[in-house]
């Protein structure tokens, strides 16, 4: 059986100031068992953007419904878009552990631009 | 507004233990990692531990085997602590939250921790 | 570990001059370099990160450059609310995160 592999098929996205920006990700299997985390950044200091287990993320929505059953989208689209938000975005599956989840891979990242709006 | 408070500091004898803690508030806490930054009085500033969003923990050379750095979540508030306190562990103890540059963009004011005997 | 050497360790200046003091690297750190200001008493504030972008808030006439191991910081004219301590910080992906001695800008 191959090894889940993480594919965020585009390198960079530009998105206009105040549109939303799709981000995409998908994995090539449903194991191993784990949620995915959406982040900014790769370092010890990255930002977390989504997490599919828990928390609050007011602008953010999944292009898919990830608890249907066999989902292996894991897209995600960002209102409201500043320039603040420009960076790269890396998608990560994480393996399901105790106590905690384990990362297990990361997608290659898409660098998120942001043009002015347009007048 | 974003906002850090450390609490916990105090006078404490080489080799006994102190806490610190850091109330956040201002910002998602729980999507950011945050770090511990020290100054011993009239010198510079030293890095001393972060803690990521996932729960990572990394420490200074200085401190490794010595010191924990820990977070709840529900309450915003990251912790370190200190056991077996050395005299060259005397600063002021900042805490400060990372953005995902891992650049420390907001800082408390900052604990003193005296260690002598 | 990196080690940051600033100089020079204290620069006296007159209100309205320019400031320009460097931070350089004991191996590369690309862009990845960070300044902060500390006036006594207060906590540090982020000024520039990646070497030359300015923090929110942060005036135009601070600004930074360089690459690898050498990197300057320059006020264009001092404002006497300028007159601290400034530190660099290297911000590569991983700790240990590692900060230079510092240059304090006096008055003259």
């Known amino acids: 059986e191959d090894e889940l592999q993480v594919i965020q098929p585009e390198k960079s996205v530009s998105v206009a100031a105040g549109e939303s920006a799709t981000l995409r990700c998908a994995m090539t299997s449903l194991i191993p068992v784990g949620p995915i985390m959406w982040f900014r950044g790769a370092g010890a200091g990255r930002e977390l953007i989504y997490n599919q287990k828990e928390g609050h993320f007011p602008r953010v929505t999944t292009v898919s419904e990830l608890t249907k059953r066999n989902n292996l989208d894991f897209s995600i689209s960002i209102s409201n878009i500043t320039p603040a938000d420009a960076g790269t975005y890396y998608c990560v599956k994480f393996r399901k552990g105790s106590p905690d989840d384990v990362e297990f891979k990361s997608g290659a990242g898409t660098e998120l631009s942001v043009r002015a709006k347009p007048s | 507004d974003v906002q850090l408070v450390e609490s916990g500091g105090g006078l404490v004898r080489p080799g006994e233990s102190l806490r610190l803690s850091c109330a956040a508030s201002?910002?998602?806490?729980?999507?950011?990692?945050v770090t511990w930054v020290r100054q011993a009085p009239g010198e510079g500033l030293e890095w001393v531990s972060l803690?990521?969003?996932?729960?990572?923990?990394y420490y200074a050379d200085s401190v490794k085997g010595r010191f924990t750095i820990s977070r709840d979540n529900s309450k915003s508030t990251l912790y370190l602590q200190m056991n077996g306190l050395r005299a060259e562990d005397t600063a002021v103890y900042y805490c400060?939250?990372?953005?995902?540059?891992?650049?420390?963009?907001?800082w408390g004011l900052g604990t003193l921790v005296t260690v002598s005997s | 570990e990196i080690v940051l050497t600033q100089s020079p360790g204290t620069l006296s200046v007159s209100p309205g001059e320019r400031a320009t003091f460097s931070c350089r690297a004991s191996q590369t750190v690309g862009s990845k370099l960070a300044w902060y200001q500390q006036k006594p008493g207060q906590a540090p504030r982020l000024l520039i990160y990646?070497?030359?972008t300015r923090a929110t808030g942060i005036p135009a006439r601070f600004s930074g450059s360089g690459s690898g191991t050498e990197f300057t910081l320059t006020i264009s004219s001092l404002q006497s609310e300028d007159f601290a301590v400034y530190y660099c910080?290297?911000?590569?992906?991983?700790?240990?995160?590692?900060f230079g001695g510092g240059t304090k800008v006096e008055i003259k």
């Open positions: 803690i990521s969003v996932t729960g990572t923990t």
């Open positions: 201002g910002f998602t806490f729980t999507n950011y990692a």
């Open positions: 990646d070497a030359n």
């Open positions: 910080q290297q911000h590569t992906d991983w700790p240990p995160y590692t």
């Open positions: 400060a939250k990372v953005t995902w540059k891992n650049v420390f963009d907001y």
